[in-house]
Amino acid sequence: APAGPPVGVKVTLIEDDTALVSWKPPDGPETVVTRYTILYASRKAWIAGEWQVLHREGAITMALLENLVAGNVYIVKISASNEVGEGPFSNSVELAVLPKETSESNQRPKRLDSADAKVYSGYYHLDQKSMT
């Protein structure tokens, strides 16, 4: 399995209810990535263990997060897999989707890169303690 997580994870709001998540393949020894797994959810849903899962093939390093709801903070993390198995998840990245009147024009929704974000548990199931 890949030894490290995808790097350079960024999440950016590109429409009022749609974000673009992008990333780069894991660092380290040459590893052929066959699939990426993207987990995302609002902070409240994440704490409750109600995440959404997207899969993207190994040549693709972008995905859309759609139907986001203004006023929520969304958490995103990504792992890479190959024929051996799944590697570790990236640090979590948060995106705050602001109400429309504050996200237009020159206002920019808060976006954190993975280097700035809190590190949460790498497991799919997260309990409440891991979010505090």
Epitope: I14, E15, D16, T18, L20, R35, L54, H55, R56, E57, I60, M62, A63, L64, E66, K100, S103, E104, S105
Partner: nanobody, 123 residues
């Protein structure tokens, strides 16, 4: 079938300006969000900016914020990107695009129909 034709690219010195245009035909241009994306030589596609159907919501990538301005004229079915204070790292082919809404695991997020317009920033 959507047809998009980008124009306005060229060679410009660092600090210079260009205005890109994207003429659309064959679709209800005024009812869709539109995006500018770019691809630098040897690199992947990078999202640059977006504008809502009526122009009231606008977003920019951090790398261009404060330097680029997106706009549209629905009466002319045309999308624009005013690029100021250009830098060498802005060198790329620029495309106008729409988001592709498809959950296939092999899809890419943007539908790019045009040939793009090359912007080269060099002294």
């Amino acid at each position: 079938e959507v047809q998009l034709v980008e124009s306005g690219g060229g060679l410009v010195q660092p600090g210079g300006s260009l205005r890109l245009s994207c003429a659309a035909s064959g679709s209800a241009f005024g009812s869709h969000w539109m995006h500018w994306v770019r691809q630098a030589p040897g690199k992947g596609l990078e999202w640059v900016s977006s504008i809502s159907s009526g122009g009231s919501s606008i977003y920019y990538a951090d790398s261009v914020k404060g330097r680029f301005t997106i706009s549209r004229d629905n009466s002319k079915n045309t999308l624009y990107l005013q690029m100021n204070s250009l830098r060498a790292e802005d060198t790329a082919v620029y495309y106008c695009a729409r988001v592709r809404r498809d959950d296939d695991s092999n899809y890419r997020p943007f539908d790019v129909w045009g040939q793009g317009t090359m912007v080269t920033v060099s002294s």
